[in-house]
């Protein structure tokens, strides 16, 4: 897996009028890292793990850069000619990667109302667009605007490529990137459900990456899907993830049930507390 830095900016228009403010999210190696809220951009570390390692200078720099990018994206949205009434969104996703062989990748992607219409390889400047005529019309419109803007401001796309990689390298150097695997903490609890039944819940937390298998077994055999309830795998605010699985069992049969967990090639079983 390459190391990656991903900027996701969204601006909105209502009845053809571009709204002030924007939403920005930054992911580092796939984990929520920074966020700017709509009206007042203040880059916020997503969880203690980021705040502990990076100082105020980082947040100031990211705030300044994201604010500038948000302003540029609002101007781009204002130039989209075919805006109908109602709410519309323009989203820019910029990604850079450093691979194990030290080769790099950088790209930006534009979405209008959630539909991809234009991409650019920032390292080579190659533009690509989907085949649909609506996407191509939008793409030409936005491309021409970006081209004119770049000529006026003398800012070229290789600068974006260099800047993104520079930030990623800075974050990697600072040690903010978590090691590739963090095993989960698994905790099994029980609660009364109805007369003669109990609900047993198995929680896994603090794990990375997010892919995990969590299920209940009876006498070593997995229970059917429809007898178990799963929670979503959600970020826990510390750059790691959490999830849960629950099932209803007969009181007195607890010793027959175990929670099975598999994560990054490791697995374990956890009994129901008596």
């Amino acid at each position: 897996e390459p190391h990656s830095l991903r900027y996701n900016l969204t601006v909105l228009s209502w009845d053809g009028s571009v709204q002030s403010g924007f939403l920005a999210e930054v992911h580092l190696d796939g984990q929520p890292f920074l966020r700017c809220d709509r009206q007042k951009c203040r880059a916020k570390p997503q969880g203690q793990w980021a705040e502990d390692v990076l100082g105020n200078k980082t947040w100031d720099r990211e705030t300044r850069d994201l604010t500038g990018n948000g302003k540029d994206l609002r101007m781009t949205l204002a130039h989209i000619k075919d805006q109908k009434e109602g709410l519309h969104s323009l989203q820019e996703i910029r990604v850079c990667e450093i691979h194990e062989d030290n080769s790099t990748r950088s790209s930006q992607h534009f979405y209008y109302d959630g539909e991809l219409f234009l991409s650019q390889n920032l390292e080579t400047e190659e533009w690509t667009m989907p085949q649909s005529s609506r996407a191509q019309t939008l793409a030409m419109n936005v491309r021409n605007f970006l081209k004119e803007d770049a000529m006026k401001t003398k800012t070229h796309y290789h600068a974006m490529h260099a800047d993104c990689l520079q930030e990623l390298r800075r974050y990697l150097k600072s040690g903010v990137v978590l090691r590739r695997t963090v095993p989960p903490m698994v905790n099994v609890t029980r609660s009364e459900a109805s007369e003669g039944n109990i609900t047993v819940t198995c929680r896994a937390s603090g794990f990375y990456p997010w892919n995990i298998t969590l299920s209940w077994r009876q006498d070593g055999v997995s229970l059917s899907h429809d007898t178990q309830q799963w929670g979503d795998v959600l970020p826990d605010g510390n750059g790691t993830y959490q999830t849960w699985v629950a099932t209803r069992i007969c009181q007195g049969e607890e010793q027959r049930f175990t929670c099975y967990m598999e994560h990054s090639g490791n697995h374990s079983t956890h009994p129901v507390p008596s």
């Epitope: 080769s103 390889n121 390292e123 080579t124 400047e125 796309y157």
Partner: antibody, heavy 115, light 108 residues
């Protein structure tokens, strides 16, 4: 119809500078695409040397970086290659080509480095 | 840099047979930046397949391409006499752009 045509001396002395020009017709080099130089030594494979993009950005193969310069003349719709301090290893057929997936090529020009 | 390795180096087949040429990369490549070329003696290469699977203008349908990540394939379903040539793969994901060393397709 897009056409590319290389021109320049076919013989260059060792340690001198190789200079080639690619003239493009049927498409403006400032509209889009990268405008590349690619070479092929006798009996060998293809080597990408570098490009100048529609925006004027240049990118070079690191193996040549200290010796190569690619520039453009937008008024003439041409782009050029300069390769300094040449040796016999630079003897090759030199092609200019358009794009990133190179969809149009010149016919190539043979450059021999010899005293 | 991303190194592309083509296999086999030489492929000896007869007209009418199916040809399968492979190209392997040292690092993952986006499929939209992967292309194939054909070169005949004394001629410039010509674009055959762009963005992994799209036929370039004027290329017959017996040519097809597939692949993703680090592994790509060019297939010629039924060889015609004019298909015997050298084939190169190329990546445009990252600088420097690189070519494979070529596969020579020769008549058996």
């Amino acid at each position: 119809q897009v056409q590319l045509q290389e021109s320049g001396p076919g013989l260059v002395k060792p340690s001198e500078t190789l200079s080639l020009t690619c003239t493009v017709s049927g498409y403006s080099i400032t509209s889009d695409y990268a405008w590349n130089w690619i070479r092929q030594p006798p009996g060998k494979g293809l080597e990408w040397m570098g490009f100048v993009s529609y925006s004027g950005t240049t990118k070079y193969n690191p193996s040549l970086k200290s010796r190569i310069t690619i520039s453009r003349d937008t008024s003439e719709n041409q782009f050029s290659l300069k390769l300094s301090s040449v040796t016999a290893a630079d003897t090759a057929v030199y092609y200019c080509a358009r794009g990133y997936g190179f969809d149009y090529w010149g016919q190539g020009t043979t450059v021999t480095v010899s005293s | 840099e991303i190194v592309l390795t083509q296999s086999p180096a030489t492929l000896s087949l007869s007209p009418g047979e199916r040809a399968t040429l492979s190209c392997s990369a040292t690092s993952s490549i986006s499929s939209i930046y992967f292309h194939w070329y054909q070169q005949k003696p004394g001629q410039a290469p010509r674009l055959l397949i762009y963005r992994t699977s799209n036929l370039a203008s004027g290329i017959p349908a017996r040519f097809s391409g597939s692949g993703s990540g680090t592994s790509y394939t060019l297939t010629i379903s039924s060889l015609e006499p004019e298909d015997f040539a050298v084939y190169y793969c190329q990546q445009g994901t990252t600088i420097p752009f690189t070519f494979g060393q070529g596969t020579k397709l020769e008549i058996k």
